[in-house]
């Protein structure tokens, strides 16, 4: 290889080791009969070279650094060459430097041609490995602006006191034209302007200067983006810091066309702009830091560029103005992530301030409107709290456990709607009761309705889940020692035609001992599966259960365990089961870590089951599955 | 123009040492792949190799002589330094300097004139 | 250490004729890379020696193409078409591809 280096060209060429491999054999550059790791080439300079392997590309890389001087000197504007040719370079990763130094009141600007370019974060890498690096400087200190690749947005990029440019080429690549020119600008008055250009619908995703580090003290960086008028912006916060500030405010301002209030200033944790239309520009400007303790400013932000959708004119009214402890979230449904360019799905307060995801809370009446091209995209989550604090007040007090109508109308699909209900320690406890009897979801007999209720505790420190229920059984009642939560879960669309089904009641009772009761009335000819709580993962050591089943005059109960044996090992205490006819108080007592269970049994009354599990060893776990079936009585046996 | 002058003490007594200069213009030593050699030649005799500096200051020796050769070199001044210590009788030759470089064909393109060195008590 | 061997002390040519003078070296000497680092270089009276020929078959800038060079491995072999007056002197064989560098015992080029 021979490398010729102009006179007078400030170009400096270095050959250096690269990312050191797993290469069984070292490889070197051979000159002047040396085997080197480093060469470097400066301007007026003719070398002749070879390397002592086969694949130099593997152990080794190049940089070439061209220095161009505006302070001395005209500066050369225009279209940036690559000097020396690529096809004049051994096949190496290479990085091209330019490091334009100007005086602070020039601006200059860096144009990219198509494709334009797209900011990539920490740790991301480009496709086609084609990298460029950019930074500027205040002062002495230089300031990343970003690492970007091609097929973006990023247009054109305007800095002042110098710019350093790397655009890094993998050694395979055919690329021979730099890609963009340098232009002098009048000086800017800040970090930098970065433009980006929306010809259609797609989406930028972009950061302050040093990210993931902090912004530059008391600096001010903007953003301008170009946006056809026949299509809609919308802003949001990925991910974003705060500094701590001595004086002035952090904050980011838009300069939105046809607003009255320009610029309009948020704080970062606002809520972002949506549903703009046609250009506007995003200013972040930075505050002056607590000496002591700076902490950082950054910024990673998306900007969304789609067609505005049907929805996006109609507004709907969510009154939450007569509720209390209520909080509704609006938010995406996890979904695969496909690679092509999907249209945002926003949701938005007052028409203005859109977001991928909403909380509204209760006490006030919120208007929203949709910005997403499919609704089906986003999701319901609501939660509420139906607390008791004084025991006396409460006792008897029952609270419907409804889904609000105005939740209903909403074009969103309801996923959760959780009230949580708490009540005193030791002094109350819970009874729900269903407008429809409930089925307990199991494997045997899964749930096939729009929607169940899933039923657990409520105290952290609690892992007890009771289970998963559903319109359409035999369960009454259930009864809970204490706090628990509930939880309207919807499977289909069609819950908003079986919204009618749903209804609970709860409803404060003196307090029991017991973790939970389920009153259970069979219907005839159907067959009542019933199983413990936290199934798979075992009934809570020391936790007691029961059922009260109610068996007609006529009919007779078929009682079955669906193993022989429960499983658990006890390492303290003991498992049992009791099984009790109402009417005669007659009882069986089996111990469930011993004995083998029943075989099935038949009762000719209402009667108890009663489970009470002991500490158990890990691993052996108590679950019990059992079912009741009625049958008419043929002989009467009384 | 590529030139290199070698300037010695011309006669010096065995047991001395013998100190050298190569002075050189046209080229610069601190251009990757750039060296220069030392090179004597008693009279009438053929050439022996002696010591080679290269750009980045890393040395060549030739082993008969390495525990008495000292080569040096000041890129800013353009001059490479040789050093043999406890000359005698034997180290009387003309000393030559050549410029080596990988853009230059990896040989001693460029040779000085020679400065004579004569040994003796 | 690579001994450079020239067999020939003297070699009496008439002007115009050929002449060929051969180079022999203890080992090989090629270097690591490939490259065999042979030279051949011209001593005149009383000047200092000039380069004729690099890495074995290469003429230097300013050269004669009447001298070529050739061989490979321990054998070279440096030619002249038609010697000429000013080709008169003392002609070394060197190698730098191991330290130390060794010349060649010299060939004297006279005049029959």
């Known amino acids: 290889f021979e490398i010729a280096l102009p006179r007078e060209s400030n170009i400096t060429v270095l050959i250096k080791l690269g990312t050191p491999t797993l290469l069984a054999k070292p490889c070197y550059i051979v000159i002047s009969k040396r085997h080197i790791t480093m060469l470097s080439i400066k301007s007026g300079e003719r070398i002749v070279f070879t390397f002592s392997c086969q694949s130099p590309e593997n152990h080794f890389v190049i940089e070439i650094q061209k220095n161009i001087d505006c302070m001395s000197g005209p500066c050369p504007f225009g279209e940036v060459q690559l000097q020396p040719s690529t096809s004049l370079l051994p096949t190496l990763n290479r990085t091209f430097i330019w490091d334009v130094k100007a005086h602070k009141s020039i601006g200059l600007e860096l144009q990219f041609s198509i494709p334009r370019l797209r900011q990539i974060g920490p740790g991301e890498s480009c496709p086609d490995g084609v990298t460029h690096s950019i930074s500027g400087r205040i002062d002495a200190t230089v300031v990343r602006i970003g690492t970007f690749c091609s097929n973006g947005t990023v247009s054109r990029i305007k800095m002042q006191e110098g710019v350093k440019m790397a655009l890094h080429l993998p050694w395979f690549h055919p690329r021979n034209v730099s890609g963009f020119s340098i232009a002098n600008r009048s000086s800017i008055k800040r970090l930098c302007i970065i433009e980006s250009v929306f010809e259609g619908e797609g989406s930028a995703t972009l950061m302050s200067a040093n990210y993931p580090e902090g912004f530059p003290e008391d600096e001010l960086m903007t953003w301008q983006f170009v946006v056809p008028a026949h299509l809609r912006a919308s802003v949001s916060f990925l991910n974003f810091n705060l500094s701590n500030c001595e004086r002035k405010e952090e904050r980011v301002e838009y300069y939105i066309p046809g607003s009255t209030t320009n610029p309009e200033v948020f704080k970062l944790e606002d809520k972002q702009p949506g549903n703009m239309a046609g250009n506007f520009n995003l200013s972040l400007q930075g505050c002056d830091q607590d000496a002591q303790s700076p902490g950082i400013l950054r910024l990673q932000f998306q900007v969304l560029v789609q067609h505005p959708q049907n929805e996006s004119n109609k507004i709907y009214v969510v009154d939450l103005s007569n509720e209390r402890a209520m909080s509704l979230t609006i938010e995406p449904r996890p979904v695969k992530q496909s690679r092509k360019f999907v249209p945002g799905c926003f949701v938005c307060l007052e028409s203005r301030t859109c977001s991928s995801n909403l909380t509204l809370t209760s006490g006030s009446k919120h208007k929203i409107s949709f910005l997403c091209d499919d609704l089906t995209r986003l999701w319901m989550n609501v939660e509420k709290t139906i607390s008791c604090t004084d025991h006396r007040y409460c006792q008897r007090k029952s609270y419907s456990l409804q889904v609000p109508s105005d939740i209903l109308h909403l074009p969103v699909e309801l996923h959760d709607f959780s009230w949580k209900l708490l009540v005193p320690k030791d002094r109350l406890s819970l009874v729900l009761v269903p407008a429809q009897k409930l089925q307990q979801h199991t494997h045997e007999k899964p749930c096939n309705t729009s929607f169940s209720y899933l039923v657990a505790s409520a105290i952290p420190s609690q892992d007890l889940y009771f289970g998963s229920f559903c319109p359409g059984g035999s369960i009454k009642q259930i009864q809970v020692k204490q706090n628990i939560s509930v939880t309207l879960r919807t499977f289909a669309p069609s819950f908003q035609q079986e919204a009618s089904r749903q209804g609970l009641t709860v409803s404060f009772i003196p307090y029991f001992k017991e973790e939970g009761v389920f009153t259970v009335t069979p219907d005839t000819k159907s067959k009542v599966y019933l199983r413990t709580p936290n199934w798979d993962r075992g009934l809570p050591s020391l936790t007691s259960v029961s059922w009260n089943i109610s068996v007609p005059r006529d009919q007779v109960a078929c009682l079955t365990f669906f193993k022989e044996r429960s499983g658990v090992v006890c390492q303290t205490g003991r498992a049992f089961m009791i099984i009790q006819e109402q009417r005669t108080r007659a009882e069986e007592i089996f111990s469930l870590d011993e004995d083998v269970l029943p075989k099935p049994s038949f009762h000719h009354h209402s009667f108890w089951v009663n489970i009470s599990n002991c500490s158990p060893t890990s691993g052996k776990q108590l679950d019990l599955l059992f079912s009741v079936t009625l049958t008419p009585r043929t002989v009467d046996l009384t | 123009e590529v030139k290199l002058v070698e300037s010695g003490p011309g006669i010096l007594q065995p047991s001395q040492t013998l100190s050298l200069t190569c002075s050189f213009s046209g080229f610069s030593l601190s251009t990757s792949g750039m060296g220069v050699s030392w090179i004597r030649q008693p009279s009438g005799k053929g050439l022996e190799w002696l010591a080679h500096i290269y750009w980045d200051d890393e040395k060549r020796y030739n082993p008969s002589l390495k525990s008495r050769l000292t080569i040096s070199k000041d890129t800013s001044s353009n001059q490479v330094f040789l050093k043999i210590t406890s000359v005698d009788t034997a180290d009387t030759a003309t000393y030559y300097c050549a410029r080596e470089g990988s853009a230059n064909w990896e040989a001693m393109d460029y040779w000085g004139q020679g400065t004579t060195v004569t040994v003796s008590s | 250490d690579i001994v450079m061997t020239q067999a020939a002390l003297s070699l009496p040519v008439s002007l115009g004729d050929q002449a060929s003078i051969s180079c022999r070296s203890s080992?090989?000497?090629?270097?690591?890379?490939?490259?065999?680092?042979l030279e051949w270089y011209l001593q005149k009276p009383g000047q200092s020696p000039k380069l004729l020929i690099y890495k074995v078959s290469n003429r230097f800038s300013g050269v004669p193409d009447r001298f070529s060079g050739s061989g490979s491995a321990t054998d070279f072999t440096l030619k002249i078409s038609r010697v000429e007056a000013e080709d008169l002197g003392v002609y070394y064989c060197?190698?730098?591809?191991?330290?130390?560098?060794?010349f060649g015992g010299g060939t004297k080029l006279e005049i029959k």
């Open positions: 080992q090989n000497i090629v270097y690591t890379n490939g490259i065999t680092y």
């Open positions: 060197f190698q730098s591809s191991h330290v130390p560098w060794t």
